[in-house]
């Protein structure tokens, strides 16, 4: 298949990846679907440097990332290993809090106003960030 060698219009290139920053809100699953329709995925943060880059672009706004534990263990949407990978949780997070009264716990991760991560109810309509890697064959196996 063809390879993407430059970022689409309105996407920001950084370290051989392309990023798109939403200005509206969606539930986590809908944000995930949006990115997939763009042949991308919700952002996967693999380093402190990438964390700072994303944080700079989103500002102090709750924003979904591609990390969830809806099926048990925490998983990155692109298969990056969670246990050995970069983490930037707020103190005492993730806590799978049930006290919000919305039913269930908290299964989706987002950037908070200071950039550190929190788990929250996946239905909340937060902004989101899509990411796609450059030089990756665009004809890849289906993500679904």
């Amino acid at each position: 298949g063809s390879e993407r060698t430059c970022c689409p219009v309105n996407w920001v290139e950084h370290e051989r990846s392309c990023y798109w920053f939403s200005r509206s809100g969606k539930a986590w699953a809908d944000a995930d679907n949006y990115c997939r329709l763009e042949d991308a995925h919700l952002v996967v943060v693999t380093s402190w440097e990438e964390q700072k880059f994303v944080q700079h672009h989103i500002g102090p706004v709750n924003t979904w990332m591609g990390l969830h534990d809806q099926n048990g263990p925490w998983k990155w949407v692109d298969g990056t290993d969670y246990e050995t990978g970069f983490k930037n949780w707020r103190p005492e997070q993730p806590d799978d809090w049930y006290g919000h009264g919305l039913g269930g716990g908290e299964d989706c991760a987002h950037f908070t106003d200071d950039g550190r991560w929190n788990d929250d109810v996946c239905q909340r309509p937060y902004r989101w960030v899509c990411e796609t890697e450059l030089d990756k064959a665009s004809q890849e196996p289906p993500l679904l």
Epitope: V9, N10, S24, K26, D30, N33
Partner: antibody, heavy 123, light 107 residues
Framework: EVQLLESGGGLVQPGGSRRLSCEAS????????MSWVRQAPGKGLEWVSV????????YYVDSVKGRFTISRDNSKNTLNLQMNSLRAEDSAVYYC????????????????WGQGTLVTVSS | DIQMTQSPSSLSASVGDRVTITCRAS??????LGWYQQKPGKAPKRLIY???SLQSGVPSRFSGSGSGTEFTLTINSLQPEDFATYYC?????????FGPGTKVDIK
Amino acid sequence: EVQLLESGGGLVQPGGSRRLSCEASGFTFSSYAMSWVRQAPGKGLEWVSVISGSGSNTYYVDSVKGRFTISRDNSKNTLNLQMNSLRAEDSAVYYCTKGYYDSSGYYYPFDFWGQGTLVTVSS
Amino acid sequence: DIQMTQSPSSLSASVGDRVTITCRASQDISNDLGWYQQKPGKAPKRLIYAASSLQSGVPSRFSGSGSGTEFTLTINSLQPEDFATYYCLQLNSYPFTFGPGTKVDIK
């Protein structure tokens, strides 16, 4: 000028198959997710399926899951809909549609529509 | 699935009238809503996207408003070419769903 030209419609027996095609021109086809929308005679509009620009990701309405397959050939600027196990309720005009990116890069489907192709499922 | 309802289902109006069509979503869809016009035997044409943004080339007498679950399409000073069926469409989550339509005909 953007053009979408559907073909492949016709009369098919219940349980039969049909393959619809949509030939696109006037835009960079591989950069756009594409959708199929249908409209039964005298009825409203129903979204059927969507496919990402590379063809890697697809979504369907529940009523066609497992029976319809959306695909694309970016080298030929063509969108396809393979319809199997057809039922009377699949009778409709099928429209091929593309979307639109606003100034922030947000994608809005269903910006431009072809003229449609009629599929009639009847014995 | 998100259900979309429209009211009225049909209306009769005269040239020059101000026409208002309402669309309601069964859950919050933010501003992920479009409005479409369809004439008999023709493909739909988008009038409004993102609830209130006017599609390029569409006359300014068409306007959209609303957010969340309730949305409105307004046609100021109805023209002869505006007699058609109007559909709303939610793009917030799969499956994308259309409203049942509102037919605007001549009084």
